[in-house]
Each structure stands twice: as structure tokens, then as C-alpha cells.
């Protein structure tokens, strides 16, 4: 997992709430699941289910947990050391170049093409030309064959946010 979490909001600054455990920084940094105090003398635990940190750090705030959007399912909840993992619902997918939303998978291939790949949470169905075997560009076909796809079973999350 990377140190820079993509576009995560910061959790509200955490003053010493009673439920937040404190410990001393180790060599000036705080462990995963904690952030550093403003004077640099304490490590303060993140709040389970609200915020997190994944690395040894000198963050002044833990990072706010991602909330899965409608159209997504939660694969694993947010812990103090790992962000929520969200995945597109069955029949939808998220492409790397448009990660902001889940898009509906096509229900079939254009005429003259055959389906070689199912809809998965991270890819649309894959169509190839019957003769040449070259891939279809992915535009929604004007005319669809009666061949339809069944949503693929997810093998891994399509979007790791943390």
C-alpha cells in the first residue's frame, strides 16, 4: 500500500479523547494505526471505523475512512491500519481511467464478435472478432447479438483505496 492515499479527506483533528490510546513515538515516528501529536511527543491511536493510517508516519491527523458509494459493495471494513475496500456491484465495473464511478457492463457483443471475457468488477465483457481474434474497442454496440454475459465472480477488489 502506498503512503499517499488517493484523495482521502483528513479526519477532524484528534485531541486527547479518553478512548484514544497514547504511546511514545519510536525514533520520531508513529506506528500504523496512529498519528503524531502536535508537540511530537505522543502517538495517538486512530478511531476504529472512522479513520486510519497505514504506515509509520508523522501525520498530524489520521486519514478518514472511505465510505463505499451506492453501486459499490464493501469487501472489507475500515480498520485503524487499513482503509475500507470497496468493489463495484455485480454487473458493473470500474475502469482504471475512470475510477470515480462503476459503469454497467454490456450485455452482449456486437454482431460478428464473440465474447471471450466476462464482466468483472474491474472490466467490461471482452469481445473479439470471430475471424481475426482482435479485441473490440469497448464502445457500446449499436446492434447486439443474443449472446449475453453472466456477471463474473469477483476474484479481487477493483478499487483498493488504502
Amino acid at each position: 500500500e502506498s503512503a499517499l492515499i488517493t484523495q482521502q479527506d483528513l479526519a477532524p483533528q484528534q485531541r486527547a479523547a479518553p478512548q484514544q490510546k497514547r504511546s511514545s513515538p519510536s525514533e520520531g515516528l508513529c506506528p500504523p494505526g496512529h498519528h503524531i501529536s502536535e508537540d511530537g511527543r505522543d502517538c495517538i491511536s486512530c478511531k476504529y471505523g472512522q479513520d486510519y493510517s497505514t504506515h509509520w508516519n508523522d501525520l498530524l491527523f489520521c486519514l478518514r475512512c472511505t465510505r463505499c458509494d451506492s453501486g459499490e459493495v464493501e469487501l472489507s471494513p475500515c480498520t485503524t491500519t487499513r482503509n475500507t475496500v470497496c468493489q463495484c456491484e455485480e454487473g458493473t465495473f470500474r475502469e482504471e481511467d475512470s475510477p470515480e464511478m462503476c459503469r454497467k457492463c454490456r450485455t452482449g457483443c456486437p454482431r460478428g464478435m464473440v465474447k471471450v471475457g466476462d464482466c468483472t468488477p474491474w472490466s467490461d465483457i471482452e469481445c473479439v472478432h470471430k475471424e481475426s481474434g482482435t479485441k473490440h474497442s469497448g464502445e457500446v454496440p449499436a446492434v447486439e447479438e443474443t449472446v449475453t454475459s453472466s456477471p463474473g465472480t469477483p476474484a479481487s477488489p477493483c478499487s483498493l483505496s488504502g
Partner: antibody, heavy 119, light 106 residues
Framework: EVMLVESGGGLVQPGGSLRLSCAAS????????MSWVRQAPGKGLEWVAT????????YYPDSVKGRFTISRDNAKNTLYLQMNSLRAEDTAVYYC????????????WGQGTLVTVSS | DIVMTQSPSSLSASVGDRVTITCKAS??????VAWYQQKPGKAPKLLIY???TRHTGVPDRFTGSGSGTDFTLTISSLQPEDFATYFC????????FGQGTKVEIK
């Protein structure tokens, strides 16, 4: 007087490697968290790596993770940045920086060393 | 990442002028903002941290203010040695910087 002096910059081909050094003096080096920050030509500054005072813990941004390694030798008062699989976009002036005592931000910087990645 | 938008990118001023540089964070960073001064070929110098605390040896003509998302560096009366580039930095979540403001002689 706090002094940080970087060295090791130069011209390297894409895919190549380079190791930068930063010689520290004027303070107890082993007590401070240290970082590398870079500035590409005509662009803003970008944090590159951070290492704990004893050298046990490190962290990096996405852009360099898995390619760059920060390390330190407290006996020699020296900070290092090993840069592998260099890309054209890594071309920048690289600064070594010290995190202050109670401010959680950089209080002293070196004057930088230029790394140019080009074929 | 938290984006720090600094303005203006450059300005021309005369000795004795009052100069104001602003920095806007893309989300709340509390008061975890520092301001630095840099001259060509030199190391950046810390001026202000925690948004308004002057670093050791920094003249009192340099003043920082703001909290949340809006921050300002003010030089009350510009001196010849103040012509330089200034940049802001947030340090609440990792470290990100403004693009810099070049203060030039009018």
C-alpha cells in the same frame, strides 16, 4: 550552525541508478527525522521520502515507492537516497531536509543537488 | 493529496511595500502550515510554522496568519534582502507544497 550538504547528483540515463548523499553537521544527527524533497524544473516541491531518527522506519509517496530507498548512517552523520529505475520525470533538484524539534515540519534544508534523467 | 494553491505566482514590489501572499488548502489542515523563503541556488529557509509562529531569527516584518484552508504570509515593509521566492507547505497529511510566489523588484 546547522549544515546539510547534498552530493551525488548528475546525468543518468532512463532506467539507470544514482545514490545521493547528504552530509549533516552542526546538530545531533541521530536525534532527527530526515527527509528528501525534490523540485522539478519550473515546478513545485514534492516530498520524496522520510526516515526515522534511528533509521528503522521509512515511508514514501506513490511516485517513488519501490524505486527509491532512503537510508542513513548515524555514525557518519550522513543521509542517503538510492534511486533506481530512474525516469525522465525524476529530473529535479533533490534537497535533504531535517524535521524540527517540536514543529513536525522541515526547519533546515540543504541547497540541493541536480539529478538529470535523459538519454 | 492535499493541494496547496498559492497566489500570486509572481509579483513586483518596491522596497518599503507591504506584500501579501496567500495559500489555499484543498481541505482543512488546521494550522499545520509553514512558509519558506528561497533564493536562487540557496537552501530554502523556514520563516513561519504552525501558520503564525516565526522561526528563530526571522524578522518581525514577516507575519503568518490563517487556519483551516486559508493562509496568508505578509511582509509589512519589504527590504532589499526579501526579494526571493516564497512557498507554503501543509504538513497535516504527509507534505505538500504551494507552487511558489516570486517577489521581484519593481
Amino acid at each position: 550552525e546547522v549544515m546539510l550538504v547534498e552530493s551525488g547528483g548528475g546525468l543518468v540515463q532512463p532506467g539507470g541508478s544514482l545514490r545521493l548523499s547528504c552530509a549533516a553537521s552542526g546538530f545531533t544527527f541521530s536525534s532527527y527525522v530526515m527527509s528528501w524533497v525534490r523540485q522539478a524544473p519550473g515546478k513545485g516541491l514534492e516530498w520524496v521520502a522520510t526516515i526515522s531518527s534511528g533509521g528503522s522506519y521509512t515511508y514514501y509517496p506513490d511516485s517513488v515507492k519501490g524505486r527509491f530507498t532512503i537510508s542513513r548512517d548515524n555514525a557518519k552523520n550522513t543521509l542517503y537516497l538510492q534511486m533506481n529505475s530512474l525516469r525522465a520525470e525524476d529530473t529535479a533538484v533533490y534537497y535533504c531536509a531535517r524535521r524540527g524539534d517540536s514543529m513536525i515540519t522541515t526547519d533546515y534544508w540543504g541547497q540541493g543537488t541536480l539529478v538529470t534523467v535523459s538519454s | 493529496d492535499i493541494v496547496m494553491t498559492q497566489s500570486p505566482s509572481s509579483l513586483s514590489a518596491s522596497v518599503g511595500d507591504r506584500v501579501t501572499i496567500t495559500c489555499k488548502a484543498s481541505q482543512d489542515v488546521g494550522t499545520a502550515v509553514a512558509w519558506y523563503q528561497q533564493k536562487p541556488g540557496k537552501a530554502p529557509k523556514l520563516l513561519i510554522y504552525w501558520a503564525s509562529t516565526r522561526h528563530t531569527g526571522v524578522p518581525d516584518r514577516f507575519t503568518g496568519s490563517g487556519s483551516g484552508t486559508d493562509f496568508t504570509l505578509t511582509i509589512s515593509s519589504l527590504q532589499p534582502e526579501d526579494f526571493a521566492t516564497y512557498f507554503c507547505q501543509q504538513y497535516s497529511s504527509y507534505r505538500t507544497f504551494g507552487q511558489g510566489t516570486k517577489v521581484e523588484i519593481k
